[in-house]
Each structure stands twice: as C-alpha cells, then as structure tokens.
C-alpha cells in the first residue's frame, strides 16, 4: 500500500495473507468459514511452492494469539483467467479446515448486486504489499482509503486505454494506491467487499494508471458454485 498507514490491529478480521513457503505473496479475503478469495495470478508466482493462508494476523512476523496458518485443500482459479490478461483475475482457496472464527477472524460480506459503485465513493484497501517505490515491505498490515474512479476515465488512452471491462472497477492512484504484494486483497466499500486487487505488473502511485480491481458482484454465480 502506497501512501497509506498502519491499520488498526485486527480491525479487518477478514484479511488474509496468502503465503508460499512461509513468505507473504498476496492478499486475500475470507468470504466463508473455509474459503479465501484472492487473485488468480498469485498462483502463477507460487510455482511449486507450498501455498498456505494466514488468518488473524496484524504483524507477519510477531506472535499473536489470533494468528493461524492454514494449509490449502484446493485452489480454484477462475476458469477463464489467463496469464497474459487481468480478466477474471479471481482465485478461491479452500482451507484444509474451517477457520476458527473470533473477533480477529471473520468472513466479510461480499457484494452480490451487479451494479457499479458510485464514482467518488471512498473505499478501503488493505494489504502487506510494498509501501515504497524502493520495494520496502511492511511487517504490519497497511490500509488506505481510495475514491472509486468512473470506468470511462479509467479507459482513456492516457490511463488504461480500453482495458477496463464491465467486470472491473478502478480507484484513484494519485500517490495513494495498492501495489505489489497487495494483489488478491479486498477493496471494501461501506463494509462490503466490492473488489479484489488485480495482480498485473502495474505502476503504482501514478494518477494516470489507476488501480484495477475485479468486481466480485460480477462473479457471484461462479463464487456461489465453487462454495456450494
């Protein structure tokens, strides 16, 4: 997260760290007791490493009573996701067992009504992604509030030049932005999960390259079918 600040500890109990061989790789969001939603491209970076999900964490390194690392029973990328595009960049991870819920571990309601968030709405994005252009990684969860940007502006030639489909949404990126390592994390508007950070190699913090988020409402049928 660029231009953000440290989150209040455990105030986002849905927040997950998707890890490979014990290292943070991507964000994720607990959407059901046994399921974490993340970005499909995160799996590509995992290679053949052991994928696990950390729940109940604020610090990645310090012991915390609520922290627990779960093995992944099944990884389900969206069937239409492709390595060369950010389309359908969603991944569902089934935990090896149901998460132990509590004040620091709790699923987040996700948007099912397929309607665009009003541009200008301030939404919260959180993650353990880099906090500087130099690539500094935080130990503790960061977050930032970002205004939603209308799709027409996001699709301008100076911005994402037509790449933003109806199944994506954008948020402003003027110095405050999601960045590398935040992919798969939640964009939360009004207490509801609206978007998932896409995992392209986008420049961060440049106002002409807004953050791109996969709209979960557009994938309600797929999410429901996997969780069923």
């Amino acid at each position: 997260i660029l231009g953000g600040r440290e989150a209040e500890a455990h105030a986002r109990p849905y927040m997950a760290s998707v890890q490979v061989n014990g290292e943070h790789l991507c964000g994720g969001v607990l959407v059901a007791e046994q399921w974490v939603l993340s970005a499909a491209h995160c799996l590509e970076d995992a290679a053949d490493g052991k994928v696990q999900v950390l729940l109940g964490a604020h610090s990645l390194s310090q012991p915390e009573p609520s922290k627990r690392l779960y093995d992944v029973l099944r990884a389900v990328p969206h069937p239409d996701s492709r390595p060369d595009t950010i389309d359908h960049d969603l991944l569902l991870l089934q935990l090896s067992e149901k998460a132990t819920l509590g004040p620091a571990v709790r699923p987040l309601p996700w948007q099912r009504v397929d309607r665009d968030v009003e541009p200008g709405t301030l939404c919260d994005v959180a993650g353990w992604g880099i906090v500087s252009h130099a690539g500094r990684r935080p130990d503790r969860l960061q977050h930032v509030l970002l205004p939603v940007l209308d799709r027409a502006t996001c699709n301008r030639r100076t911005h994402h030049d037509g790449a933003i489909t109806q199944r994506m949404m954008c948020a402003e990126s003027n110095r405050r932005d999601s960045c590398k390592g935040d992919s798969g994390g939640p964009l939360v508007c009004g207490g509801v999960l609206e978007g998932v950070v896409t995992s392209g190699s986008r420049v961060c913090g440049n106002r002409k390259k807004p953050g791109i988020y996969t709209r979960v409402a557009s994938y309600a049928a797929w999410i429901d079918s996997v969780l069923a």
Epitope: D150, A152, N155, R156, R157, G162
Partner: antibody
Framework: EVQLVQSGAEVKKPGASVKVSCKAS????????MYWVRQAPGQGLEWIGE????????NFNEKFKSRATLTVDTSTSTAYLELSSLRSEDTAVYYC????????WGQGTLVTVSS | DIQMTQSPSSLSASVGDRVTITCKAS??????VAWFQQKPGKAPKGLIR???SRYSGVPSRFSGSGSGTDFTLTISSLQPEDFATYYC?????????FGQGTKVEIK
Amino acid sequence: EVQLVQSGAEVKKPGASVKVSCKASGYTFTSYYMYWVRQAPGQGLEWIGEINPYSGETNFNEKFKSRATLTVDTSTSTAYLELSSLRSEDTAVYYCAREGGFAYWGQGTLVTVSS
Amino acid sequence: DIQMTQSPSSLSASVGDRVTITCKASQNVDTDVAWFQQKPGKAPKGLIRSASSRYSGVPSRFSGSGSGTDFTLTISSLQPEDFATYYCQQYNNYPLTFGQGTKVEIK
C-alpha cells in the same frame, strides 16, 4: 462489432444551429469517453471536445467552447454535438470517435454552411 | 495549445520504399501520441497509440517511436494501399491537437 453511426449530411444557413448524432453499438456506451473532431474541405483534423457519457462531464477546445454543446442519451447510446451561430468556416465533415481501446470513428457527417 | 509540427507535408515514394514521417511537439507530451491514416472520403484509421504500440490488425510494417517532443512513424516497405495522408495526434494535454498531415503519394 463496435460501430459508431452518424446522422446524415446537413445544409444550414449562417447563424443557424446544427445537431449531429453519433449512435454507438457493440460496447458499453458509458465506459468510454466520446470525442468530436472536424475536418474542413482539404484541411487537417481539428479536435472540438469530448464528453464522459457516464457523468456528462465535458472538455472543450477553447475555440469552440462558446458555440459547441456536447450531450449524450445513455438510453439510446447516442452522443450529440450541437454547434450554434454557424458561419461558412464551419463547413466541414464532423466525426465522433471513441476515446480508449481500439480507435473507432464514425463515418463522418458533412455540414455545409451556405447562404 | 501544444503544436504538433509534422514533416514533410508531402512526399513521393515508390512501392517497397522505406518512409519516415516525423512529428515534433512544442512541449513534452511523454508518449501520449497516436498516428492515424486517412484515405480520401474516409474516416481516419488508428495505426499507433502510446507512440509505439500498434493497434490490432495494423500490419507490422508500420512502427512508431519517440517520447517527449520527437516522434516518428515509419513504414518499412511501402505497399500500394499505404498511399494516404498520415496525422499525428497528442492526447497528453487539452486541447488534443493534430499535426497538419503528411500526404504520401506515388512517385
């Protein structure tokens, strides 16, 4: 298939107004700005302005700001350019074009201003 | 306004020739430059965006380069269908502006 289909040719008298339409199909109309360009006979291309169909926000070339009005009807996915106080120098082909992604242009509308 | 000065204004060339058209911006426009091809009585057709990215379906003989203030469109081997007028456009700043055009004619 994306298409921008413009209204037919117009002949107007000096001082009159003209309204050119541009009907979009094959994509989500509100997801892309629409801009307008004109080309006088034998001349180059001149940018008039643009509109965000989602918000209605417009940006104009200062040269046209006082005389040009850009509007949209999202229910029919149509963009409009209205040019008032026409003079003979406004005789030109007027084009709409989608801003972003592939460079889609309308076929052009010839507006002739003659007394 | 940003002036886009295109040169030459016209050129004569033969099929198979390598053709280079240049466009100079009066101030820095990063890589926010597009190139269009226009044939008589037709709407302009996009060739290049972001100074060097070809639009899909555009033959590889068309290439663009440059950043800042100096931009080039190159046709590596001119084909009969390439005889047309070419325009550069900057979209970095309002108002968007075009070069005055380069007419490529048959020698």
